[in-house]
């Protein structure tokens, strides 16, 4: 309750491919960064596929106010919700409600959050109460993952090549995040 969505558009994406955006310009503070040494999980291919770019899942863009108790954000935030099954991009509908989702005959592929980001929000509260500052966790992008037969969230397997955690330097790839956080809020919000 209290979540007001006033914009809802959808785009089709191909996760895990292409260039990653430049990070925002540095704030004028005393952040200091060093490039971390290489580490983490090497790229892998959980199952055979001729062209990963053939597979896609959908990001729904929602712009809405966020709330914390009786307090509401001064400005709306735009976030993503990962929607639907994954399948060959050529068979996915270009708009929600058109066509049919392709379902693989074998494992189930799910479109889930890939990366998260933090956004600062100021919350305005009723009755003259002091405003609050919070950092909200927002989905930054979606990806296709393979769902095991037990359909356990923690058992989601990567679909397509995935780099290890970005080794953070001047041009990092925003860090991959798991599927657990924020799912309940997103499911309840719409």
């Amino acid at each position: 309750q209290g979540w007001q969505a006033f914009k809802n558009d959808a785009t089709e994406i191909i996760p895990e491919l292409g260039e990653y955006p430049e990070p925002p310009p540095e704030l004028e503070n005393n952040k200091t960064m060093n490039r971390a040494e290489n580490g983490g999980r090497p790229p892998h291919h959980p199952f055979e596929t001729k062209d990963v770019s053939e597979y896609s899942c959908r990001e729904l863009h929602f712009t809405r106010y966020v709330t914390d108790g009786q307090c509401r954000s001064a400005k709306p935030v735009t976030e993503l919700v990962c929607s639907g099954q994954c399948g060959p991009a050529r068979l996915l509908p270009n708009a929600i409600g058109r066509g049919k989702w392709w379902r693989p005959s074998g494992p189930d592929f799910r479109c889930i959050p890939d990366r998260y980001r933090a956004q600062r929000v100021q919350l305005l509260c009723p009755g003259g109460a002091a405003p609050r500052a919070r950092k909200v966790r927002l989905v930054a992008s979606c990806k296709c993952k393979r769902l095991t037969r037990f359909h356990n969230q923690s058992e989601l397997k990567d679909f397509g090549p995935e780099a290890a955690r970005p080794q953070k330097g001047r041009k990092p790839r925003p860090r991959a995040r798991g599927a657990k956080a924020n799912q309940a809020e997103l499911e309840n919000a719409y």
Partner: antibody, heavy 121, light 109 residues
Framework: EVQLVQSGAEVKKPGASVKVSCKVS????????MHWVRQAPGKGLEWMGG????????IYAQKFQGRVTMTEDTSTDTAYMELSSLRSEDTAVYYC??????????????WGQGTLVTVSS | QAVVTQEPSLTVSPGGTVTLTCGSS?????????PYWFQQKPGQAPRTLIS???DKHSWTPARFSGSLLGGKAALTLSGAQPEDEAEYYC?????????FGGGTKLTVL
């Protein structure tokens, strides 16, 4: 529930390096924002660095720039903090700390048990 | 780098009220510093009491509260208990870079 388990105590000589590990359970490391904090004997807490989810980068405290490296192994959900060119004043308990993966980012909610690093010749 | 200041020590009587403060060398502390308060007892890791100025955690006793007072972050303890004797640290967020205060040793007697 997030749980953090750190590696055991270390004794190092001046000039050497130390690498402390922090194993995450309950969530995957990629869902969390990991930070490192140290505490010298009888002294206060000192933030060394950590992952900033606003711009997707690991940020190091100015004091440790060039000496500290924070890395993560997502295959084992283990974070590492390596401090080089050790000196006696680096003798401290080193903590990893992380958020709780909620809708609102709340950092430093869960702490490891600490790793004592002693630097002595 | 900013310096975060706290009272080195404070004493409170059991059942009494005490306020710990946290100032910044860069000016007034605001909600945009997302002040944190931690409690640490000897031989233990710190634990978070307050995040984001005033947000309590499930394990935070109701007698603790966070606020901003006179350009500083404040932690108020109302109805002090013997088990509240500990070191208390504040932490401020300077745009992704964090700085701890020097800590306040709180004695309950």
């Amino acid at each position: 529930e997030v749980q953090l388990v750190q590696s055991g105590a270390e004794v190092k000589k001046p000039g050497a390096s130390v690498k402390v590990s922090c194993k995450v359970s309950g969530y995957t490391l990629t869902e969390l924002s990991m930070h490192w904090v140290r505490q010298a004997p009888g002294k206060g807490l000192e933030w060394m660095g950590g992952f900033d989810p606003e711009d997707g980068e690991t940020i190091y405290a100015q004091k440790f720039q060039g000496r500290v490296t924070m890395t993560e192994d997502t295959s084992t959900d283990t974070a590492y903090m390596e401090l080089s060119s050790l000196r006696s004043e680096d003798t401290a308990v080193y903590y990893c700390a992380t958020d709780s993966a909620g809708y609102w980012y709340k950092f430093f909610q869960h702490w490891g048990q600490g790793t004592l690093v002693t630097v002595s010749s | 780098q900013a310096v975060v200041t706290q009272e080195p020590s404070l004493t409170v009587s059991p059942g009494g009220t005490v306020t710990l403060t946290c100032g910044s060398s860069t000016g007034a502390v605001t909600i945009d510093h997302y002040p944190y308060w931690f409690q640490q007892k000897p031989g233990q890791a710190p634990r978070t009491l307050i995040s984001d100025t005033d947000d309590k955690h499930s394990w935070t006793p109701a007698r603790f509260s966070g606020s901003l007072l006179g350009g500083k972050a404040a932690l108020t303890l109302s109805g002090a208990q013997p088990e509240d004797e500990a070191e208390y640290y504040c932490l401020l967020d300077y745009g992704g870079t964090f700085v701890f205060g020097g800590g306040t040793k709180l004695t309950v007697l």
